[in-house]
């Protein structure tokens, strides 16, 4: 006869009840809401009343644990997803309900990522608002421009350049460097961070640019904006199927359409549609290429990447990495093809998943060259997949608001105790580096910072110069050895130049897979 | 704070060359990335070329690329600004600026307004 180990109980199914239930609709801390629809009843050992069945045992109901991403947490326990923190409270996650900062990027020669999550192909070749919040009857803030060159058709010589028009002033991101056209009025909450193959663009407390030096750039907006921006990154609304919508304000179908309607100037032509299957850029004309190209995207779906997949669908970036690696001339240049692994790669880590995919033969990177001694640098470089993207230096002394986590490359190890000068390259003691202190807060050297900027009776503009702080009122312009500023660049400025050197890329890709 | 003294300059013929020299005072030079402006009677100060603090690369307007080339030496604290294959359109007065700012080893500032200190200018003029 059946016996059972307590505290379990013995049921036996009777005879004459058609409709009891028995261990086949047994509860346990997975279908405990769930109803059950028994087929007939089972006789066997069941949980008393007050209590659930939880892998082999009986626990109490409120003992159940929560379940996240196949990963058991038991009550109380909390996890981040996203912005928010979520709390194991009687069987399911209570949490937090912050709106997060939305990121959207450009991805390879001719993708967008909209910030509410929508991908499309845009191949287009003029100046175009990548986002901005000048919508509608807004009086705006900023504005981000893209310029696409050699970008719709295959080619290793696309390049973006972006410009950025913030707080008065304007900079472009261009062929790997960051030129400061015009200085922001007020550049208390400016900074450029370059951390390992990324530069990093804080532009205000609710604005960030991270850009790989390439063609990826990302936009990274606080929740103040939600809803008040437009441009080819779409309106930060939560809401995918209306980010195609036009500078006049139609929800286009055809992302060429939509493209075409965010141009700078009406002086550069629309771009065209193409099918996509007649496009070179499909490989579809090169049978070889196309296998090899399509086998060696699939590392994006492979085993390598799983933990990532089941956080960050990976499709947008196979579509890309297909795309720009048939564009690619020839099959010897990888650079395409890892600029899109990494992009992944770059998402994954900020979601949580650090995926070590570089090997010694696929998109290699390696750090020595920054460590020769005859460069008289004294700190160790070694690459990283995910090391901490803003870290605090001499140049940026006090912890910045980083829109990302953390950023694959070269990253500088100094002993503990020491940081980074930027400048000099060596590991030095804090106390040594050139900074100023004002209202408790170190500044680095050359940083103009506005202080009490809302009190006119206190408001101050103080400038670091090496170690030497000076401060002025704020309503008084003069003090500083500064000529006449030159009269504002338009930003609807179109470029027009022969672009014939390759691009630089930092590591190679001896073979794709 | 530094001072910037210039020297170089004068009147030569197109196709010539010239190397302006621009000294700073103080001990804390490489602390300073400098830059290169020009101003033609009747037009706005021009960028020319900069150098950041590290000296690793150098940035240069697109009308003199592959003609001048900026240089630092540290131990002189001075910049220097080396013009090639000179035609008449880059007649001008020629100043150096300096900044503490730090923004990387790949980023400079081509605005003027970028910049604090100032040399008091040296005339260029290339005649045809």
């Known amino acids: 006869s059946l016996s059972c180990r307590p505290p379990m109980v013995k049921l036996v199914c009777p005879a004459d009840n058609l409709r009891a239930e028995g261990l086949e609709c047994t509860k346990t801390c997975q279908n405990y809401d769930l109803e059950c629809m028994s087929m007939g009843c089972v006789s066997g050992c069941l949980c008393p009343p007050g209590m659930v069945r939880h892998e082999n045992r009986c626990v109490a109901l409120e003992r159940c644990p929560c379940f996240h991403q196949g990963k058991e947490y038991a009550p109380g326990e909390t996890v981040k997803i996203g912005c928010n923190t979520c709390v194991c409270q009687d069987r399911k996650w209570n949490c937090t309900d912050h709106v997060c900062d939305a990121t959207c990027s450009t991805i390879g020669m001719a993708h967008y990522l909209t910030f509410d999550g929508l991908k499309y192909l845009f191949p287009g070749e003029c100046q175009y608002v990548l986002v901005q919040d000048y919508c509608g009857s807004n009086p705006g803030t900023f504005r981000i421009l893209v310029g696409n060159k050699g970008c719709s058709h295959p080619s290793v010589k696309c390049k973006k350049r972006v410009t950025i028009l913030v707080e008065g002033g304007e900079i472009e991101l261009f062929d790997g460097e960051v030129n400061v056209k015009r200085p922001m009025k007020d550049e208390t909450h400016f900074e450029v961070v370059e951390s390992g193959r990324y530069i990093i663009l804080l532009l205000g407390k609710a604005l960030s640019v991270v850009w790989d030096r390439h063609l990826s750039i990302s936009v990274v907006l606080k929740q103040t904006y939600q809803e008040k921006v437009c441009g080819l990154c779409g309106n930060f609304d939560g809401i995918q199927n209306n980010d195609l919508t036009s500078s006049n304000l139609q929800v286009e179908e055809d992302p060429v359409d939509f493209g075409n309607s965010w141009k700078v100037s009406s002086q550069c032509a629309d771009t065209r549609k193409v099918p996509l299957d007649s496009s070179p850029a499909t490989c579809h004309n090169n049978i070889m290429k196309q296998t090899m190209v399509d086998s060696s995207c699939r590392i994006l779906t492979s085993d390598v990447f799983q933990d990532c997949n089941k956080l960050v669908d990976p499709e947008p970036y196979l579509d890309v990495c297909i795309y720009d690696t048939c564009s690619c001339e020839s099959i010897g240049d990888c650079a395409c093809f890892c600029d899109t692994i990494a992009a992944y790669a770059h998402v994954c880590a900020q979601h949580g998943k650090v995926v070590t995919w570089r090997t010694a033969t696929l998109c290699p990177q390696s750090c020595e060259e920054r460590n020769l001694r005859e460069n008289g640098y004294e700190c160790e470089w070694r690459y990283n997949s995910c090391a901490p993207a803003c870290q605090v230096t001499c140049q940026h002394p006090e912890p910045l608001a980083c829109p990302v986590q953390c950023v694959e490359g070269c990253h500088a190890h100094c002993p503990p105790g020491k940081i980074l000068d930027e400048l000099l390259q060596t590991c030095v003691d804090p106390e040594d580096c050139p900074v100023c202190e004002v209202a408790g807060r170190r500044f680095a050297s050359g940083k103009k910072v506005t202080l009490n900027p809302s009190d006119p009776e206190h408001c101050q503009i103080c400038h670091c110069d090496v170690v030497n702080l000076t401060c002025e009122a704020c309503q008084e312009p003069g003090g500083l050895v500064v000529p006449p500023t030159d009269a504002p660049v338009s930003p609807t400025t179109l470029y027009v130049e022969d672009i014939s050197e390759p691009p630089l890329h930092d590591f190679y890709c001896s073979r794709l897979l | 704070q530094v001072q910037l003294v210039q020297s170089g300059g004068g009147l030569v013929q197109a196709g010539d060359s010239l190397r302006l020299s621009c000294a700073a005072s103080g001990r804390t030079f490489i602390r300073y990335a400098m830059a290169w402006f020009r101003q033609a009677p009747g037009k706005e100060r021009e960028f020319v070329a900069a150098?950041?603090?590290?000296?690793?690369?150098?940035y240069y307007a697109d009308s003199v690329k592959g003609r001048f080339t900026i240089s630092r030496d540290n131990a002189k604290n001075t910049v220097y600004l080396q013009m090639n294959s000179l035609k008449p359109e880059d007649t001008a007065v020629y100043s150096c600026?300096?900044?503490?700012?730090?923004?990387?080893?790949?980023?400079?500032?081509?605005?003027?307004?970028?910049?604090?200190?100032w040399g008091q200018g040296t005339q260029v003029t290339v005649s045809s």
């Open positions: 600026a300096a900044t503490s700012t730090y923004y990387g080893r790949s980023a400079y500032s081509s605005h003027s307004g970028g910049y604090d200190y």
């Open positions: 150098i950041p603090q590290s000296g690793g690369r150098s």
